[in-house]
């Protein structure tokens, strides 16, 4: 297939406080191998959301099973969403290094915005 | 406007080949993944065929495997279906629909056209 | 194969009622890979729903829809006289991408 583009379809995502966001992520292709990440935010100051190859996230879960073959959806759901959680979220595709892994190709990102619970 | 418009319908007898096209406008047809489904009269949706934004990857429902071969021409924004040794049980509407997004086969497809039937008959 | 079975085949309700569909996979699947779809008389299928929960573009907020695993619900909250049709799950992502039987919502 073409070169690997990261999809997220969803500009923007609205979730009321309390419940869970689902931030979709997907991959057009398998190649290069690496892990991906998502973040919120950009640049340096960027907040590490989650790690397909190591860390503890305990209010991340992923939609798909991400260790089966030819996956290629990397979507994710936070929960218990607070207004602290509002922000832009970007999946990105890392192709594998060594010693380390280097960033290959972000998605355009979707941004979270966040409702009072209802009363 | 994003539109699919089929073509290439009609009736056969059982055994003879048929050629189904589709024709892409207002999207770029050349990043997205592509779908034939049919439907018999008065029964369900069913999934033929699939294939890859650059055509390379083809997918096919048991039912038509061996026999109906799925391409594209991204220069021609057109989809097409080979349809050989037709049967009975082929007789339906053909619908050619585009996928949501850029990935294969992920979230659903979100352009239909409106159908080209086919009717398979001695 | 994955065989995807919706119930009930059809549902009677009123104008204004509140309408459940069900849609269940043979096995667990992943809420990416499921849509839910509208076909009227004489037109093509509508895509309402993908990824499980997430409205297409245009659908009213009316329609919603829920699960994972293996079950799956589509919810009209209220239905309008536009709504009374036929209701469609699928399958993506893997080959064969399976539909369900369908649902038909008609006017009691």
């Known amino acids: 297939e073409d070169e690997l583009q990261v999809i997220q379809p969803e500009k923007s995502v609205s979730v009321a406080a309390g419940e869970s966001a689902t931030l979709r992520c997907a991959m057009t292709s398998l190649i290069p191998v690496g892990p991906i990440m998502w973040f919120r935010g950009a640049g340096a100051g960027r907040e590490l959301i989650y790690n397909q190859k190591e860390g503890h996230f305990p209010r991340v879960t992923t939609v798909s099973e991400l260790t089966k073959r030819n996956n290629l959806d990397f979507s994710i759901s936070i929960s218990n969403i607070t207004p602290a959680d509002a922000g832009t979220y970007y999946c990105v595709k890392f192709r594998k290094g060594s010693p380390d892994d280097v960033e290959f190709k972000s998605g355009a990102g979707t941004e979270l915005s966040v409702r009072a619970k209802p009363s | 406007q994003v539109q699919l418009v089929e073509s290439g319908g009609g009736v056969v007898q059982p055994g003879r080949s048929l050629r189904l096209s589709c024709a892409a406008s207002?999207?770029?047809?050349?990043?997205?993944?592509m779908n034939w489904v049919r439907q018999a009269p008065g029964k369900g949706l069913e999934w033929v065929s699939a294939?890859?934004?650059?055509?390379?990857?083809?997918f096919y429902a048991d039912s038509v495997k061996g026999r109906f071969t799925i391409s594209r021409d991204n220069s021609k924004n057109t989809l097409y279906l080979q349809m050989n040794s037709l049967r009975a049980e082929d007789t339906a509407v053909y619908y050619c629909a585009k996928d949501f997004t850029e990935v294969v086969g992920w979230l659903g497809m979100d352009v239909w056209g409106q159908g080209t039937t086919v009717t398979v008959s001695s | 194969e994955i065989v995807m079975t919706q119930s009930p085949g059809t549902l009677s309700l009123s104008p204004g009622e509140r309408a459940t569909l069900s849609c269940r996979a043979s096995q667990s699947v992943s809420s990416s890979y499921l849509a839910w779809y509208q076909q009227k008389p004489g037109q093509a299928p509508r895509l309402l729903i993908y990824?499980?929960?997430s409205r297409a573009t245009g659908i009213p907020d009316r329609f919603s829809g829920s699960g994972s695993g293996t079950d799956f619900t589509l919810t009209i909250s209220r239905l309008e006289p536009e709504d009374f049709a036929v209701y469609y799950c699928q399958l993506l992502g893997s080959s064969p991408r399976t539909f369900g039987g369908g649902t038909k919502v008609e006017i009691k």
């Open positions: 207002g999207f770029t047809f050349s990043a997205y993944g």
């Open positions: 990824g499980a929960s």
């Open positions: 294939i890859s934004a650059s055509g390379r990857s083809t």
